[in-house]
């Protein structure tokens, strides 16, 4: 086992004419990231064949905004190495693809936007444990400079990381049956390395990384005693009453699941249900990545597929939290103005506006009278978000389009009779009353509560209401 490491030194316009335009602009800032794909062997493999040796995604580089009028410089790069762990032997010959991606940082409503800027590929021979190899590759008008190496993870050594070595326990010689580890004469070939945590008392291995149990023991690390099946229950009565062996502790006793995992017994052993952020037989592995599907509710996962790569979730509208696990109560922020009703539809926010208001957030106060003509000489009066017409005499209705019956409201007091007239209404007053609406009684001595009637109008004559 080991790690292939790639260090990107620069990405920018190559030499010669036709310098590419900067991929970023003041209007559309962006940042770069890189993807590496490794395949074993030198054969010209189909482009779509998988990255059998592994793949990795870099972190995002710093945000870059082009200076107006300036040529595209070398673009700012992400920090750190791209690391591709390999589990088996290093093949010595390999093919690589390195992709340069641009992430646009403009309007984030629809999540990040990615586009492939450049892709370079090559085939190389490389021994593990050797020095950094430098390379320059061109893709169109772009140039990528990088270094790479393969290194073994202890205790593996050698040009293919297949030999297992460890420091000598004694200065003079290696243990029985173990040879010196050339060219590292101060180290010895190591015995087989069993799976980490495999019980030294109850487990053994014939292949590196495995853990096989001696009789009477079970579990992934041979730490769980096998309970006999003839007893009445897994925690059954003692041998004194049933004649059967007293079982050892149950597989979930003492909770073998780390990091808050919950244990459940299975017919052969136990199973851990791990909390988010952990996995493995005992929830012992943290390092959650995109391969675990950590982004809820359709969030976009950005990060590497290998266990050491961190991830970031870009949440769709309506969700937040590092894993997009929290539904945003966007209505609690009272985004709808002017008394509008807020509706959170999940994928979008809607405001149902009161009459007289409009806009996504009911922010526009409609000019109630705009474009609203009141007919027949009526005048428009704004108020409370609804338009109202004050109609001229003889007309009514919302827009003063209806001919009004002026007598409908019984305007003539004290039993006066109402007559509709082209210019309004006329009241014929009952004896003893006068005025436009027959509202004034006539005094018994013939005087009235009104000033003297105009010439030509006798008390009792119909009064026209002008």
């Amino acid at each position: 086992a080991g790690v292939f490491e790639l260090q990107i030194h620069s990405f920018g316009p190559g030499p010669g004419p036709g310098a590419p335009r900067s991929p970023c602009s003041a209007r559309l800032p962006c940042r770069l990231f890189f993807r590496v794909c490794l395949k074993p062997g030198l054969s010209e493999e189909a482009a779509e064949s998988p990255c059998a040796l592994g793949a990795a995604l870099s972190a995002r580089g710093p945000v870059y905004t082009e200076q107006p009028g300036a040529p595209a410089p070398d673009l700012p790069l992400p920090d750190g190495l791209l690391q591709v762990p390999f589990r088996d032997a290093w093949p010595g010959t390999f093919s690589f693809i390195i992709e340069t991606w641009r992430e646009e940082l403009g309007d984030q409503i629809g999540g990040p936007a990615w586009s492939l800027l450049a892709r370079v590929a090559g085939r190389r021979r490389l021994a593990a444990g050797g020095p950094w190899a430098r390379d320059i590759q061109r893709a169109g008008a772009w140039e990528l400079r990088f270094s790479y190496r393969a290194r073994c993870e202890p205790p593996a050594v050698g040009t293919a990381c297949t030999r297992l070595c460890r420091p000598r326990s004694a200065p003079s010689r290696c243990g029985p049956g173990l040879r010196p580890c050339a060219p590292l004469e101060d180290e010895c070939e190591a015995p087989l390395v069993c799976r980490a945590g495999c019980s030294p008392e109850h487990g053994f291995c014939e292949q590196p990384g495995e853990c096989r149990c001696l009789e009477g023991w079970t579990g992934p690390l041979c730490t769980v005693p096998v309970s006999t099946s003839s007893c009445l229950s897994p925690r059954g009565p003692s041998s004194a009453t049933t004649g059967c062996l007293v079982p050892g502790p149950g597989p979930c006793d003492g909770n073998p699941c780390a990091n808050g995992g919950s244990c459940s017994e299975t017919p052969r052993s136990f199973e851990c249900t791990c909390p988010r952020g952990f996995y493995g037989l005992r929830c012992e592995v943290s390092g959650v990545t995109c391969a675990d599907g950590p982004c809820f509710n359709g969030g976009l996962c950005v990060g590497g597929a290998d266990p050491d790569s961190a991830y970031i979730c870009h949440c769709p509208p309506g969700f937040q939290g590092s894993n997009c696990e929290k539904r945003v109560d966007r209505c609690s922020l009272q985004p709808c103005r002017n008394g509008g009703l807020c509706l959170d539809l999940g994928h979008a926010l809607r405001c149902r506006c009161r009459a007289g208001f409009a806009g996504p957030r009911c922010e526009h106060d409609l000019d109630d009278c705009a474009g609203r003509a009141c007919a027949n000489g009526g005048t428009c009066v704004e108020g409370g978000g609804a338009h109202r017409c004050s109609c001229a005499l003889g007309f009514g209705g919302r827009d003063c389009r209806e001919r009004a019956d002026p007598c409908a409201a019984r305007p003539c007091a004290h039993g006066g009779r109402c007559y509709a007239h082209f210019s309004g209404l006329v009241c014929a007053c009952a004896p003893g009353y006068m005025g436009a609406r027959c509202e004034f009684p006539v005094h018994p001595d013939g005087a009235s509560a009104l000033p003297a009637a105009p010439p030509g109008l006798r008390p009792g004559d119909p009064q026209r209401y002008l």
């Epitope: 999540g111 936007a113 976009l300 950005v302």
Partner: antibody
Framework: QVQLQQSGAELARPGASMKLSCKAS????????ISWVKQITGQGLEWIGE????????YDNENFRGKATLTADKSSSTAYLEVRSLTSEDSAVYFC?????????????WGQGTTLTVSS | DIQMTQSPASLSVSVGETVTITCRAS??????LAWYQQKQGKSPQLLVY???NLADGVPSRFSGSGSGTQFSLKISGLQSEDFGSYYC?????????FGGGTKLEIR
């Protein structure tokens, strides 16, 4: 090379359940998701859900909640789709597809499809 | 749910012609869109991902464009093997939905 081999055509009775399988080969099973897609004959495609074999996490289409269950067995590199309480509306071709786990997302390899016929 | 509206639903063209299929999202999905081709009785195949990126092994006569809510797939110089159905699919928020499809037939 990458392959997704789906189980053969199935005939089922209404009310029954059916478990369809999708065996992956040619890549690391736990480094990708597996999505399931339904296609009624002569119609379009409908996404049912996705499972991440490494963690067992699933994300589903609410339209299939209670109807479809997604599981995966890492040891055999096989994903399963169980369709319950079958009706004639479940008669369709069901595809599994390999899904990228980090954005940009896409389904880059598809199984050949399993035809499920529900009939009494 | 985000609705994906594809147009036209079908079109009849001759070999050598250029066609453009469009896909409209009911809300902004930025570039989170893929295009697939499906031939009769076969499974779909990836053509374009992230709206504009050609999948490995796809001929350069195919090209994707667009961002936000409007997307298109262009096929320049149609070949006989290009006939079949085409689908767009978004990847922004759940559920991931497909367009209704465009059936491309030989005239």
């Amino acid at each position: 090379q990458v392959q997704l081999q789906q189980s053969g055509a199935e005939l089922a009775r209404p009310g029954a359940s059916m478990k369809l399988s999708c065996k992956a080969s040619g890549y690391t099973f736990t480094s990708y998701g597996i999505s399931w897609v339904k296609q009624i004959t002569g119609q379009g495609l409908e996404w049912i859900g996705e499972i991440f074999p490494r963690s067992g996490n699933t994300y589903d289409n609410e339209n299939f909640r209670g109807k479809a269950t997604l599981t995966a067995d890492k040891s055999s590199s096989t994903a399963y789709l169980e369709v319950r309480s079958l009706t004639s509306e479940d008669s369709a071709v069901y595809f599994c597809a390999r899904t990228t786990v980090f954005a940009p997302y896409y389904f880059d390899y598809w199984g050949q499809g399993t035809t499920l016929t529900v009939s009494s | 749910d985000i609705q994906m509206t594809q147009s036209p639903a079908s079109l009849s063209v001759s070999v050598g012609e250029t066609v453009t299929i469009t896909c409209r999202a009911s809300e902004n999905i930025n570039s989170n869109l893929a295009w697939y081709q499906q031939k009769q009785g076969k499974s779909p195949q990836l053509l374009v991902y992230a709206a504009t990126n050609l999948a490995d092994g796809v001929p350069s006569r195919f090209s994707g464009s667009g961002s936000g809510t409007q997307f298109s797939l262009k096929i320049s110089g149609l070949q006989s093997e290009d006939f079949g159905s085409y689908y767009c699919q978004h990847f922004w928020g759940l559920p991931w939905t497909f367009g209704g499809g465009t059936k491309l037939e030989i005239r």
